[in-house]
Interface confidence: medium
């Protein structure tokens, strides 16, 4: 009974989510005044109401002394699983934001416009996307955003978008919206650094006492302007750098060392010349190749000088001069690299020398060519393997999973909540990897079915019997290691898994590297030694995110073998044996923990 | 050895002034530090007063009771000193003298023995 | 401001026992919190920062911990020179360095 009670609120609260009603969400007013000289960038962040971020949304209807029986949106404490929608101003329905707007990008509860344009006018929603309880429908942000360009130019020195912080120094952050008005008639001003309150900064320009790298990221510069009828929050956006000072040398010459080069008569000849250039905020390197013949002097056209590596004191950068082929003329010449910045130039010159013993030189090249030619298609053959595994599975083999009396092809464990600070915070959360990507890419694309306890088991956590015994009905066990992982209870999932697997043969276990993490002294022998010798795939960030990745084809290559055809019917039949379980779940146990009991 | 010594304490009567003074030994203030000041009253908790960055900028930081009635200032390159006017009873605390790491970390890791003042008719 | 409450006030534990401190924060302050030990006339020593953090040369016997704005001190194999009072404290996320506020302490008795 308790558990068809569940299921009705949670189908009633899915309904509620399709078109639910935005005249209950809070309103924002924002506005955009962007330039028309530069490029800037705008954000929005999803302010729920304080109560929601402490997942308490409907407040109003509780007294303080009632507690409700259910928390609602136990979901994140980072508020980093919302949605966000544009309402059309036509009337038509909500539009998801992450399928109509390419220049609009989501990243957790901030959404980021990359151009600035009036068109991004208009209403944006957002709200949690897990739903856990009826009351949560109505938690909700609405933010009007008025964008426009800028028509006085009574500013000219308006503070840029974009602004540097000299290392080790001094700085300041000037808010770009109020940069003309002197800090006695300034508003008061909201300051935000990669979407968190400054809470001590009020004032339109932030002093900062000593640079250090950590001082770079993203600002964000509030402050409200109020006319008779309403009041707008006016937002701007500060990209901040770090930077070393300028460069005090000019730049060296890297290659060519030698002022000689032997060569073949006849031969197709390139010369590359290598500079490297410090720092200069206003950076406009010379980079140039000359021919001397005698007494004349004069500049080659080469392709397009190219930047190798650039880091935050110096940048290197690289011209090749190209000879189609190499002639007695060119033994005369000198060919000089010439390099230049803001401080002076430097100069390299070339002579050309025949080579000898030639003919011997052919055969051993020969050699090393058939030997390179080998280990090239060696090593070819090495880094598409995977690839090649999996096109001969689409084509060949046969489904590995028929009649196996496995209910799932893989369980998939990773920490829950998290006591560390996050690894991550300017890339993908380990849960978001596992509640979304995980069920977008293997289910939705490959058809593979896979078991998350927090969706398709019981959200609050389970016995420890029930994890072992999920795991013995999956074919493959997925777990995403991470600081929050080996540390946390969570890490009994992996020991149990080592523990299966090495009575069933036909559990595999699989590895993600999430992020860089030390191994407790704390963990089983058995953990550990499982860490050195299972498979590991490395998740490489927002690199791995598309479902074309290495990452996803390798995690494919660790799967079991499926047919790809068969697996609507496949999920049907999943589908209602989660729903047995879940009926079972619910009804059988009753003292719900967040960690996994009597292990 | 990097140390921290405070002075300037003593019995004092409501409504006086008072500087204390914290020396520094074993370090100086070039690279950039936050010095700053903390009270406890007897058989009491800790309580942050005021920080002031000994590096270019000299920014001054105030919990928000202590604006107005207290002054933090830095005298040379190893000292830094804390005025305090219109003393009352319970002002009566060991005034510590903290450094913090002079990184990102944000903590106290240099303390002085502390000084202690008696306010009293 | 931020305000800072440490649960309990005092605390009784025998040697070899562990003891866990916590320290509530009014207010998200990510991981921006320390730990201090504090002996009779001596001024206070640093044992932990940045929630979780151990400072250098203090034992590993301490461990530090955060959940939302509850952090958690937990000193394991209790001895009997670890008798202090512990005071948790936060500092503003701000560009520069503003401490803020310390908890009211917690006393740990050593049996």
């Known amino acids: 009974m308790l558990c068809l009670g569940w299921i009705f609120l949670w189908l009633v609260a899915g309904e509620r989510i399709k078109g639910f009603n935005i005249s209950g969400c809070s309103t924002k007013k924002l506005l955009w005044t962007y330039s028309t000289r530069s490029e800037e960038e705008f954000v929005l962040f999803c302010d729920l109401p304080e109560p929601q971020k402490s997942h308490f949304c409907h407040r109003n209807r509780l007294s303080p002394k009632q507690v409700p029986e259910h928390l609602p949106f136990m979901g994140s404490n980072d508020l980093s699983d919302v949605q966000w929608y544009q309402q059309p101003s036509n009337g038509d329905p909500l539009e998801d934001i992450r399928k109509s707007y390419p220049h609009i990008i989501q990243d957790k509860c901030t959404l980021h416009f990359l151009t600035p344009g009036v068109n991004n006018s208009g209403s944006y929603i957002c709200r949690p996307k897990m739903i856990k309880s009826p009351y949560d429908v109505a938690c909700c942000v609405k933010m009007i955003l008025e964008v426009k360009p800028q028509t006085n130019a009574s500013c000219e020195y308006s503070a840029s978008h974009k602004q540097d912080l000299l290392l080790g120094s001094t700085g300041s952050i000037s808010c770009p919206s109020l940069s003309c008005q002197s800090d006695a008639q300034s508003p008061a001003v909201t300051w935000y650094k990669n979407g968190k309150l400054l809470s001590v900064e009020r004032s339109n320009r932030i002093v900062v006492d000593e640079v250090y790298d950590y001082h770079q990221g993203t600002y964000v510069c509030d402050y409200t302007q109020s006319d008779t009828v309403s009041s707008w929050t006016v937002r701007a956006v500060v990209q901040v750098r770090t930077i070393v000072g300028d460069t005090k040398l000019k730049p060296d010459i890297l290659d060519p060392v030698e002022d000689t080069l032997e060569v073949e008569l006849g031969k197709p000849l390139t010369i590359s010349c290598k500079a490297r250039f410090g720092f200069e905020r206003v950076f406009n390197p010379v980079i140039k190749w000359y021919i001397k013949d005698s007494d004349l002097e004069w500049e080659v056209s080469v392709p397009e000088a190219k930047s190798i590596k650039s880091t935050l004191k110096d940048e290197i950068i690289e011209r090749n001069i190209i000879l189609e082929k190499v002639t007695q003329r060119d033994l005369r010449r000198k060919f000089v690299c010439f390099v230049q910045n803001s401080i002076g130039n430097t100069t390299q010159s070339v002579q050309l020398k025949e080579k000898r013993g030639v003919v011997l030189l052919y055969i051993l090249l020969g050699t090393i060519g058939t030997l390179v030619a080998v280990l090239a298609a060696s090593a070819l053959l090495y880094r598409h393997w995977i690839e090649i595994v999996l096109l001969y599975r689409t084509y060949q083999s046969k489904d590995q999973t028929l009649g196996d009396k496995k209910d799932f092809d893989a369980f998939v464990s990773y920490a829950k909540w998290s006591s560390f600070p996050s690894e991550a915070t300017s890339s993908l959360s380990e849960e978001h990897l596992a509640l979304s990507l995980f069920p977008d890419v293997l289910e939705n694309k490959y058809g593979y079915s896979l078991c998350l306890l927090e969706r398709d088991v019981a959200p609050g956590g389970v016995y420890a019997e029930d994890i072992v015994s999920i795991i013995k009905r999956s074919r493959r066990g997925i777990f995403i290691l991470s600081p929050n992982y080996v540390n946390g209870p969570s890490i009994f999932e992996l020991q149990a898994a080592v523990n299966l697997a090495l009575d069933d043969q036909t559990l595999k276990l699989i590895l993600i590297k999430f992020c860089y993490f030390q191994e407790p002294e704390s963990l089983p022998h058995l953990v550990k030694k499982a860490l050195r010798v299972l498979p590991t795939v490395t998740w490489r960030g927002l690199k791995s995110v598309p479902p074309n990745s290495r990452f996803w084809a390798k995690m494919r290559y660790h799967m079991p073998v499926k047919n790809s055809q068969g697996f609507t019917w496949n999920q049907l039949r999943i589908t209602s044996r989660i729903f047995q379980w879940k009926g079972l779940s619910r009804t059988e146990t009753t003292g719900r923990s967040s960690q996994p009991k009597e292990w | 050895q990097e140390q921290l010594e405070e002075s300037g304490g003593g019995l004092v009567k409501p409504g006086a002034s008072l500087t204390f003074t914290c020396r520094a030994s074993?370090?100086?203030?070039?690279?950039?530090?936050?010095m700053c000041w903390v009270r406890q009253a007897p058989g009491k908790g800790l309580e942050w007063i005021a920080c002031?960055?000994?590096?270019?900028?000299?920014?001054t930081y105030y919990a928000s009771w202590a604006k107005g009635r207290f002054t933090i200032s830095k005298t040379s390159s190893t000292s830094v000193t804390l005025q305090m006017t219109s003393l009352t009873a319970a002002d009566t605390a060991t005034y510590f003298c903290?450094?913090?790491?002079?990184?990102?970390?944000?903590?106290?890791?240099?303390w002085g023995p502390g000084t202690l003042v008696t306010v009293s008719s | 401001d931020v305000v800072m409450t440490q649960t309990p006030a005092s605390v009784s534990e025998p040697v070899g026992g562990t003891v866990s401190l916590k320290c509530q924060a009014s207010?998200?302050?990510?991981?921006?919190l320390n730990w201090y030990q504090q002996k009779p006339g001596q001024p206070p020593k640093l044992l932990i920062y940045?929630?979780?953090t151990l400072a250098s040369g203090v034992s590993s016997r301490f461990k530090g911990s955060r959940s939302g704005t509850e952090y958690t001190l937990t000193i394991s194999d209790l001895e009997c020179a670890d008798a202090a009072t512990y005071y948790c404290?936060?500092?503003?996320?701000?560009?520069?360095?503003?401490?803020?506020?310390f908890g009211g302490g917690t006393e740990v008795v050593v049996k």
């Open positions: 903290a450094r913090d790491t002079g990184n990102s970390n944000y903590q106290f890791n240099l």
């Open positions: 074993g370090f100086s203030f070039s690279s950039g530090y936050y």
């Open positions: 002031i960055y000994v590096g270019i900028t000299g920014s």
């Open positions: 207010e998200s302050i990510d991981s921006y």
């Open positions: 940045g929630a979780s």
């Open positions: 404290q936060c500092t503003v996320y701000g560009v520069n360095f503003v401490p803020n506020a």
